[in-house]
């Protein structure tokens, strides 16, 4: 019969003729034969394949650096890798997730918008009128001025995107 | 003809050791994967362990990793199974069974008849 | 630890097709084996790496695996294919039996 030009799925050609693919998990040991079937291996214990494949070695888990403030997120198995993220307080530098940062605080006259992940930054957003932050924060939302009308109090001092305003008596009408 | 055969079951008690033999003959031994699997009365098949052509890669199911030892001596055409620490839920028949000669890749092509291993007091 | 999930039973009438599956997480991205076992018998293999026969089993029986579920399919199934089936798999550094199909043929 005619050597094949194409194979299936799960197979690849070498020396004309179609040898089954190592599954996920699982390295090659030595190509098929006319005679004999592909040979494959499971990964070792901290090493993982996640396609089919004809490797002949499997890549090494992820290692998560606590020095770099790294933590495991998810345990690698033989066909995935190990998911690292960032220790509390911190997040990842990059979506390969190679380091951590700290978390940057939102300055006063700025409030948290969203707060940060192990994987994003805390996003701030200046205060709009109406609005206050009078502190440095990751966690911190602006927040509104007071009321002073529903204290039945009057405004003595008008707040601003980092202080909040200062309510006083009202002035008593003189007879 | 392709034969395996399976030798050195019987009743033990609980706590106790056997040591499972299996001859191979009829084919070249020391070019295939070979595991044991057992099977509960009235129960399915379960893997026991595995192991490599020539022994330096080994695989052991969890209910028995560090009671169980799967060798072989491919001069002597023979897989064994050391059985340490036995209890009554290793009660079962046990078979080695020949790899397709592909690693993790084949299915068990040739199986003996299975000896029978009882643990109770 | 990695689960194969056979259905307990199935039955067929003589010359008609029978499924048997097996079901598992991410089941398409390993090979499947297929084992028939008659009673007081040793398993044999009739099916291996998904599809393919070992020589000495009949054309009727043939495999497929895709996405979450194997099938083995024994068509013009006859009465001397009345016996237990196992479906088998590797996953990671162990290896995986269904837990048997006990295929009656009416």
């Known amino acids: 019969p005619e050597p094949p030009t194409a194979c299936r799925e799960k197979q690849y050609l070498i020396n004309s003729q179609c040898c089954s693919l190592c599954q996920p998990g699982q390295k090659l040991v030595s190509d098929c034969t006319e005679f004999t079937e592909t040979e494959c291996l499971p990964c070792g214990e901290s090493e993982f394949l996640d396609t089919w494949n004809r490797e002949t070695h499997c890549h090494q888990h992820k290692y998560c650096d606590p020095n770099l403030g790294l933590r495991v997120q998810q345990k690698g198995t033989s066909e995935t890798d190990t998911i690292c993220t960032c220790e509390e307080g911190w997040h990842c530098t990059s979506e390969a997730c190679e380091s951590c940062v700290l978390h940057r605080s939102c300055s006063p006259g700025f409030g948290v918008k969203q707060i940060a992940t192990g994987v994003s930054d805390t996003i701030c957003e200046p205060c709009p009128v109406g609005f206050f932050s009078n502190v440095s924060s990751a966690f911190e939302k602006c927040h509104p001025w007071t009321s002073c009308e529903t204290k039945d109090l009057v405004v003595q001092q008008a707040g601003t995107n980092k202080t909040d305003v200062v309510c006083g008596p009202q002035d008593r009408l003189r007879a | 003809q392709v034969q395996l055969v399976e030798s050195g079951g019987g009743l033990v008690k609980p706590g106790g050791s056997l040591r499972l033999s299996c001859a191979a003959s009829?084919?070249?031994?020391?070019?295939?994967?070979m595991s044991w699997i057992r099977q509960a009365p009235g129960k399915g098949l379960e893997w026991v362990s595995y192991?490599?052509?020539?022994?330096?890669?080994?695989y052991y199911a969890d209910s028995v990793k560090g009671r169980f030892t799967i060798s072989r001596d491919n001069a002597k055409n023979s897989l064994y199974l050391q059985m340490n620490g036995l209890r009554a839920e290793d009660t079962a028949v046990y078979y080695c069974?020949?790899?397709?000669?592909?690693?993790?890749?084949?299915?068990?092509?040739?199986w003996g008849q299975g000896t029978l291993v009882t643990v109770s007091s | 630890s990695y689960e194969l999930t056979q259905p307990p039973s199935v039955s067929v009438s003589p010359g008609q097709t029978a499924s048997i599956t097996c079901s598992g997480e991410?089941?398409?991205?390993?090979?499947i084996c297929w084992y028939q076992q008659k009673p007081g018998q040793s398993p044999v293999l009739v099916i291996y790496?998904?599809?393919k026969r070992p020589s000495g089993i009949p054309e009727r029986f043939s495999g497929s695996n895709s996405g979450i579920t194997a099938t083995l399919t024994i068509s013009g199934t006859q009465a001397m294919d009345e016996a237990d089936y196992y479906c088998?798999?590797?996953?990671?550094?162990?290896?995986?039996f269904g837990g048997g199909t006990k295929l009656t043929v009416l």
């Open positions: 069974a020949r790899d397709l000669a592909a690693g993790a890749t084949g299915g068990l092509d040739c």
């Open positions: 009829e084919f070249t031994f020391s070019d295939y994967y």
């Open positions: 192991i490599s052509r020539s022994g330096d890669t080994i």
């Open positions: 991410r089941l398409g991205n390993k090979y």
């Open positions: 790496q998904d599809f």
């Open positions: 088998q798999a590797w996953d990671s550094r162990t290896v995986v």
